[in-house]
């Protein structure tokens, strides 16, 4: 399916414009901001989603920035350049000609420079650690039940094969989901761990990207699992290149 045929919508991306102008009158959906045609049977790439988000009418919400010392995305939202496949271009620049290199999930991995900055290749993020803190519950969740439910969720909702969920760690109230996917492991059609992590992050923040489906209702053996904070750490196949100044 390219989209839901009956009412011509995109189940996996509500930030699209859809019309029955595809081949044979099929429903075709294009991402807001970029106009790129998307496959609505799978997750849309994070780059196209971020571009669509930046093109959407701004609301009054202010951005909360993560701790600057954490190995997380400290730069927040920006309007990215995406390649024809919807991946982040290795080099990103803003309107003031400040440029930087990003990894495959769009997180800056070098110091900022000018237009002369070169980013030779898009470095793949092959290991993602999703760090969650859940709201207090009557008792701790059973670890194996939690592991099973999260793997099921990533498979069924985000279409990520469980082989890319390397581990689920639990020490109440902290849950850590390790996603791993080497370039050699990722076959055509496999969802990228970066895209799955982004959809999950938006879901737990109550900002679901899915069209028409209810928000995320996470339950472990019937007990609601409510997330009160999320941190995501990214590990690239090639270490990032920051100057020592940034590390002090």
């Amino acid at each position: 399916h390219t989209a839901a045929q009956d009412n011509c919508t995109c189940p996996t991306n509500k930030m699209t414009v859809c019309s029955p102008d595809g081949p044979g009158g099929r429903c075709q959906c294009r991402a807001l901001g970029s106009g790129v045609a998307v496959d609505c049977s799978t997750l849309t790439s994070e780059c196209l989603l971020l571009k669509a988000r930046m093109s959407a009418p701004k609301n009054a919400r202010t951005l909360v920035r993560p701790n600057e010392h954490a190995l997380v995305d400290n730069d927040g939202l920006y309007d990215p350049d995406c390649d024809p496949e919807g991946r982040f271009k290795a080099r990103q620049c803003n309107q003031t000609s400040v440029c930087w290199c990003v990894n495959s999930v769009g997180v800056r991995r070098t110091d900022k420079g000018d237009l002369s900055l070169r980013c030779d290749e898009l470095v793949r993020t092959h290991h993602i650690l999703i760090d969650l803190r859940h709201r207090p519950t009557a008792g701790a969740f059973n670890h194996s039940d939690l592991d099973a439910e999260l793997r099921r969720l990533f498979r069924e909702r985000y279409r990520l094969h469980p082989k890319f969920v390397a581990a689920v760690h639990y020490e109440q109230p902290t849950i850590q989901i390790e996603l791993r996917q080497n370039t050699s492991q990722k076959a055509a059609g496999d969802v990228d761990i970066g895209d799955a992590a982004y959809y999950f992050e938006r879901d737990v923040k109550g900002e679901s990207l899915f069209q028409g489906r209810g928000g995320l209702d996470l339950r472990v053996r019937g007990e609601p699992l409510q997330v009160e904070r999320t941190l995501i750490y990214y590990l690239d196949e090639i270490p990032p290149k920051f100057s020592m100044k940034r590390l002090t």
């Epitope: 498979r155 279409r159 094969h161 969920v165």
Partner: antibody, heavy 119, light 111 residues
Amino acid sequence: QVQLVQSGAEVKKPGSSVKVSCKASGYTFTDYSINWVRQAPGQGLEWMGVISTYYGDASYNQKFKGRVTITADESTSTAYMELSSLRSEDTAVYYCARYGDGYNQFDYWGQGTLVTVSS
Amino acid sequence: DIQMTQSPSSLSASVGDRVTITCRVSESVDSYGNNFMHWYQQKPGKAPKLLIYRASNLESGVPSRFSGSGSGTDFTFTISSLQPEDIATYYCQQSYEDPYTFGGGTKLEIK
């Protein structure tokens, strides 16, 4: 309790099609994908394909591509497997099986539907 | 496709015996320590029943005499003390990549 109940046995002519149903109960239908597996008489098990009950789309074993169509109806919690251009080698018991929680194991199975292809 | 070689294809054992079945896979089904290998029991005229998932995890409600081990490409299924009700055909299966494939089966009989 989780149950997968399949439609009854069928006798079909070569060249025709058959559609087998699998009604799920005891859990939220869209939470688990459903697989189809077949077993020819006295033979082993062969995976045919899987449908995402959440998205409604299927992926198939290339061996059956073009001949098999797996669908699902969320309103009745029922999955269907249709096999076309039947030949005698398609005589088999067809099973639906639900994915388990974490590792794509098949944790619950239907009772099976015998499809006999004979002229 | 991932090929599964299961052996023996049939075996005869006495009640109380320790029974071992092996399954060799054409390529590794291990992903970061998680082995996508499962074992099923099928009795005549019945649907298969999941016994072991992820190479060594016992499915809920399955007797503890059944166990599984192995990683990568070589896996073993064991019945520690054969019971009369264990007469069945046993299959290994990989779910690492599709098409998911099954071993040829091991038919277990009582001596």
